[in-house]
Interface confidence: medium
């Protein structure tokens, strides 16, 4: 059928709560795009009518709420003028009982479900809600090992909670909690995070943190200069490489004969507790084909990545 | 503490439809999903069907064309309808709750006796 | 569809004695999110059947430590210990993995 297919990485869900995926894939094409979400290669779209508990939200998928049984690969496809790309989501059901321990078999979690506090510092937690414009976020409560969190230590702001001076207590199981309002009705988002503290003074033994990227997307002119930056932080005494990559292979290799696109020289800024790194990636000229592919910034075990974009493509979901 | 209790008809004719209800205490629909179980002497216990918290179902494919489950979460109830009864869907019928976030069944009703006989 | 199947259909026991009852599952019951979904029961004469096992090894609440079960892909087991009188009836598997669920056809622990 003409379409490119693109495979993203599996996205594991809670059951009986709302869950929401963006299309975000931007297309190989200029103007108008239309966004169409399907089932399990399935000829029929999934609905638009916004009062099904599955209905697409302009570029979105929305599941009011997700449910045992919706477990399953859906496909977005992305339709240009002169171009079609086919992305395949891989949504898996998993039971998050955050409140109790003792039932255990909880998947690998994203680093979303997995955070991490830096005793002795202020830090914070951050509640992640990704859902479309449609859907209307009440206040964050956030809870402790199944309690309310109170106290002068934590504030809440907008989506993250702040900790002062973060001891070795604070860690556990942590749950941000918020109404979603969608069409007149109420659902409950409860998003478990497992917390733990680092007894290094700085950025959590030897993960890095990659402060940029941040698995977005960046709007470029087609033929542009364009250099991103990623920027790391790690321990004095890390062993970790930095670098980027695009289809699992180091850029330099993968653009070894044009080197149209390069890694550039990775520089450090030495803090009392901690290095800062910098390694960029540059793209001499942007070409049609580095639309929508994933660059990857990659830093020991920490990974992030940039989408090049067109500028303001109108999404109409057709 | 957790209850479910199931009522409904004790005897029904072949073809005609049987409707059970369950009633439920000590949980919420919006957050536990429903299951429907059945045991008779010759097939022992057969799993019938579930209603999910959020609203959907799954039933046995076995038995999928003459199967709805559904609720009323205003009222705590949930209800199983077959229709074309045989006199092989005379059975004890249970209802049973799921297990927290979790596909299976913790708590069972003490179950409806129910014969097809004309 | 999974069929379970259960061995020995009926086992006969002095009190006190180790039981050992044991499921097979014709494919394998990982749930595609990591976990195996099989439970047990116990069903005695005139009642519901009540929870013993459930995610092949965790004991319910109020379920003596004699219980155990163990096993992954498509073998499973579920041990007594030492067992008690109150332990007599019909045990049945069920899985929770693949639509539809299925139970086993029951074990009857009976005394000798």
């Known amino acids: 059928d003409g379409c490119k297919d693109i495979f993203m990485k599996n996205e594991i869900l809670s059951a009986s709560q709302p869950f929401a995926f963006n299309c975000t894939f931007p297309p190989i094409t200029s103007g108008e795009v239309s966004v169409t979400w399907y089932k399990n290669s399935s000829k029929i779209p999934v609905s638009k009518i916004i009062q099904s508990r599955i209905h697409q939200d302009e570029t979105w998928i929305l599941f009011l709420p997700m449910e045992w049984g919706d477990s399953g690969v859906y496909q977005c496809v992305i339709k240009g003028r002169d171009s079609c790309h086919r992305i395949h989501v891989n949504l898996t059901v998993f039971e998050k009982h955050w409140c109790d321990t003792s039932i255990g078999g909880l998947p690998n979690l994203s680093d979303e479900y997995k955070q991490i506090l830096h005793l002795g510092k202020d830090d914070s937690l951050t509640c992640h809600l990704h859902f479309p414009k449609s859907c209307v976020l009440g206040p964050i409560k956030w809870y402790k090992d199944c309690n309310e969190i109170k106290g002068e230590r934590f504030t809440v702001l907008e989506t993250r909670l702040l900790v002062s001076n973060v001891s070795a207590e604070d860690r556990g199981n942590y749950a941000c909690q918020a109404i979603l309002t969608h069409s007149g009705k109420q659902y409950e988002v409860l998003n478990g995070i497992t917390v733990s503290i680092t007894e290094r003074a700085g950025y959590g033994g030897s993960v890095p943190k990659i402060i940029y990227p941040k698995n977005h997307s960046i709007e470029v002119q087609l033929g542009t200069t364009l250099i991103v930056d990623c920027n790391v932080t790690d321990t004095k005494d890390n062993t970790n490489l930095r670098c980027w990559r695009v289809n699992n292979t180091l850029v330099d290799d993968y653009y070894d004969e044009s080197k149209r696109i390069r890694e550039g020289v990775e520089t450090h800024v030495s803090f009392r507790e901690h290095n800062l790194y910098t390694v960029n990636i540059t793209f001499l000229e942007v070409k049609m084909e580095d639309y929508g592919l994933p660059f990857m910034c990659h830093a020991g075990v920490s990974t992030a990545y940039i989408i090049l974009q067109l500028p303001a493509p109108d999404f109409r979901a057709y | 503490q957790v209850q479910l209790k199931e009522s409904g008809p004790v005897l029904v004719a072949p073809s005609q439809s049987l409707s059970i209800t369950c009633t439920v205490s000590?949980?919420?629909?919006?957050?536990?999903?429903v299951h429907w179980i059945r045991q008779t002497p010759g097939k022992g216990l057969e799993w019938l069907g579930v209603?999910?918290?959020?609203?959907?179902?799954n039933y046995n494919s076995a038995l999928m064309s003459r199967l709805t489950i559904s609720k009323d979460i205003s009222q705590s109830q949930v209800f199983l309808r077959i229709d074309s009864l045989q006199t092989d869907d005379t059975a004890m019928y249970y209802c049973?709750?799921?297990?927290?976030?979790?596909?299976?069944?913790?708590?069972w009703g003490q179950g409806t006796s129910v014969t097809v006989s004309s | 569809d999974v069929l379970l199947t259960q061995t020995p259909l009926s086992l006969p026991v002095s009190l006190g004695d180790q039981a050992s009852i044991s499921c097979r599952s014709s494919?394998?019951?990982?749930?595609?999110?990591?976990?195996?979904?099989l439970q047990w029961y116990l069903q005695k004469p005139g009642q519901s059947p009540k929870l013993l096992i459930y995610?092949?090894?965790n004991r319910f609440s109020g379920v003596p430590d004699r219980f155990s079960g163990s096993g992954s892909g498509t073998d499973f087991t579920l041990k007594i210990s030492r067992v008690e009188a109150e332990d007599l009836g019909v045990y049945y598997c069920?899985?929770?993995?693949?639509?539809?669920?299925?139970f086993g056809a029951g074990t009857k622990l009976e005394l000798k």
């Open positions: 000590g949980f919420s629909l919006t957050k536990f999903g």
């Open positions: 069920f899985q929770g993995s693949h639509v539809p669920f299925t």
């Open positions: 209603i999910w918290a959020g609203g959907p179902t």
């Open positions: 049973a709750k799921q297990i927290y976030y979790s596909t299976l069944v913790d708590y």
């Open positions: 995610k092949v090894s």
């Open positions: 494919q394998n019951i990982v749930h595609s999110n990591g976990n195996t979904y």
